[in-house]
């Protein structure tokens, strides 16, 4: 058997570190037999087999030039094997975020903070957190942990299926390359980090008769469970072509009547999403929709007091929604009140109520 | 059963040093923050030391720095306190604790020990 | 890392409630939201009643409360029990040296 040990990655490759002492082990002979050692190619002897280092061939302070295939002879000539030298870094603790559309599953992804350049593979786990009491400590319930299965399609993303909206959950995300590994830890909680798509189909129609008016209307996204348990609520936002600034309202339901568009002018629309006891955030926008209020006989227009008029937000132009006030919470916020970074590597608590 | 089993204590001199064990059953270790803390006779509670569930990050308390040494085998199921150079006032029970801590995308935090081991006695005398 | 402030007794009735204070900084009790609570029996280890200033692990009666304002956290132990007589100790995250900070200790006893 070979004296070498195999490292995570290709056969035949072993692996070191630049500007370190990097040591390469003769793949065929028997751990303590003296080789001699070659840089493939070239006749130049590297290390001879009187050297004391046995099978092993010792490069102080690597660098780029080392790279590459060496051969190694034992003392009747007969080759010992070909070794190539790759050198790289060890993995640093991988950039971790996990996003969810629904209140049943979450999505993990990542991405090194540093290149090594090496091969490198992650680990990916989570398990749900408990804080026993002294009395209830002598049987803790399955809290995993559980592998979080990847994307078979190879992106740098986890899926955890069948999260429970009120628990929190720890994800571990651990970089693997042949000098070691490193994890990275994240606590997450679906209400915190709950997200949903924008709303779909949005659809704006004039209101025949009425020149001031315009009707939008919009479906659930279709990531948002089919029968929910947890309910959206909506911001619809819209203005005038050409006019800067949009107006919002915070329809009751799956439309709104708008009952000040501006006679005769085109009118972009546009709606977001977001859990109706606030948890998370709000959705990205919706694709605008485009609609024009109706030309024809007029009615009179009577002051609709049951429709929210619309409130004129000065010059909101970019593109994300100024922040939502603050959600309720039955509990503190457990992360720091201030933005330092004590050490490696935190859940916002929500209630519905 | 969720479980920690200290042991190593007993009677040193000034000077002397101790390697005390925690034994954890009942739970993944690996994934858990873990700590000591002691109680001298008679005393309130100190926070001695604290590590992360890798091992890669350790906090002490400015009373045992530089002296103890907190350390992990998680293929064990293992915590250790290292005691080097102990004075008197190191007396104390030794309690082994487990922490869920906190992790941001960017740190972990301390949080709270929901489970404690029964204590292990530690006596610096001559 | 300088121990948090409690007072050395409480005291009150069966049946009556509690409270006691634990004062600290802006850099660990005011500054996070890791504020920690445990009762300890005499010859005991300690048991956690309270964590992240507020919350009760499972187990925990509802008897027991915690809350916080600026640099001082509070546990209230109301309907005193005689089985509540017991030392109380606050804890937090110390913000240095990821380092953690216990109080000074509260005897509390239940009279009668």
């Known amino acids: 058997s070979s004296p070498c040990p195999q490292a995570w990655g290709p056969p035949g490759v072993q692996y070191g570190q630049p500007g370190r002492s990097v040591k390469l082990c003769c793949p065929g002979v028997t751990a303590g037999d003296p080789v001699s050692w070659f840089r493939d190619g070239e006749p130049k002897l590297l290390q001879g087999p009187d050297s004391g280092l046995g099978h092993e061939l010792v490069l102080a302070q690597a660098d780029s030039t080392d790279e590459g295939t060496y051969i190694c002879q034992t003392l009747d000539g007969a080759l010992g094997g070909t070794v190539t030298l790759q050198l790289g870094y060890p993995p640093a603790r991988p950039v971790v975020s996990c996003q969810a559309a629904d209140y049943e599953n979450f999505s993990c992804t990542w991405s090194p903070s540093q290149i090594s350049g090496l091969p490198t593979r992650y680990l990916t786990s989570y398990r749900k957190k408990t804080v026993l009491g002294a009395d209830s400590q002598r049987r803790s319930p399955s809290t995993g942990p559980w592998p979080c299965p990847q994307d078979p399609l190879g992106a740098a993303r986890c899926v955890v299926h069948g999260a429970e909206f009120w628990s929190q959950y720890r994800i571990n995300v651990t970089e693997v390359n042949p000098l070691g590994a490193s994890t990275r830890l994240l606590d997450v909680s679906l209400q915190s980090i709950l997200r949903p798509d924008p709303p779909q189909g949005l659809r704006v129609e004039s209101v025949p008769g009425y020149p001031r008016r315009l009707r939008a209307s919009w479906t659930y996204p279709a990531s948002w469970p089919s029968q929910p348990h947890f309910l959206l609520k909506f911001r619809l936002q819209y203005r005038p072509a050409q006019h800067p600034a949009w107006s919002t309202v915070e329809p009751a339901g799956l439309e709104e009547v708008i009952t000040d568009a501006v006679a005769g002018l085109p009118h972009a629309v546009r709606v977001s999403a977001r859990d109706f006891l606030d948890a998370g955030t709000w959705s990205t926008w919706s694709p605008e929709a485009w609609g024009t209020p109706s030309t024809g006989p007029l009615q009179d227009e009577i002051p609709d007091w049951s429709q929210g008029h619309g409130q004129q937000l000065e010059a909101v132009v970019a593109q994300e929604d100024s922040p939502a006030p603050a959600r309720p919470s039955l509990q503190p916020d457990p992360r720091p009140l201030d933005h330092r970074d004590p050490l490696e590597q935190h859940h916002h608590h929500h209630h519905h109520h | 059963e969720v479980q920690l089993l200290e042991s190593g204590g007993g009677l040193v001199q000034p000077g002397g040093s101790l390697r005390l064990s925690c034994a954890a059953s009942?739970?993944?270790?690996?994934?858990?923050?873990m700590g000591w803390v002691r109680q001298a006779p008679g005393k309130g509670l100190e926070w001695v030391s604290y590590?992360?569930?890798?091992?890669?990050?350790?906090g002490y308390a400015d009373s045992v720095k530089g002296r103890f040494t907190i350390s992990r085998d998680n293929s064990k199921n293992t915590l250790y306190l290292q005691m080097h150079s102990l004075r008197a006032e190191d007396t104390a029970v030794y309690y082994c604790a487990r922490d869920e801590g906190y992790c941001s995308s960017t740190s972990c935090y301390f949080d709270a020990f929901d489970i404690w081991g029964q204590g292990t006695m530690v006596t610096v005398s001559s | 890392q300088s121990a948090l402030t409690q007072p050395p007794s409480a005291s009150g009735s069966p049946g009556q409630s509690v409270a006691i204070s634990c004062t600290g900084t802006s850099s660990d009790v005011g500054g996070y939201n890791f504020v920690s609570w445990y009762q300890q029996h005499p010859g005991k280890a300690p048991k956690l009643l309270i964590y992240e200033v507020t919350k009760r692990p499972s187990g925990v009666p509802d008897r027991f409360s915690g809350s916080k304002a600026g640099n001082t956290a509070s546990l209230t132990v109301s309907g005193l029990q005689a089985e509540d007589e017991a030392d109380y100790y606050c804890s937090s995250y110390g913000g240095s040296n990821n380092a953690g900070v216990f109080g000074t200790g509260t005897k509390v006893t239940v009279l009668g």
């Open positions: 590590i992360y569930p890798s091992g890669g990050s350790t």
């Open positions: 009942g739970f993944t270790f690996s994934w858990y923050f």
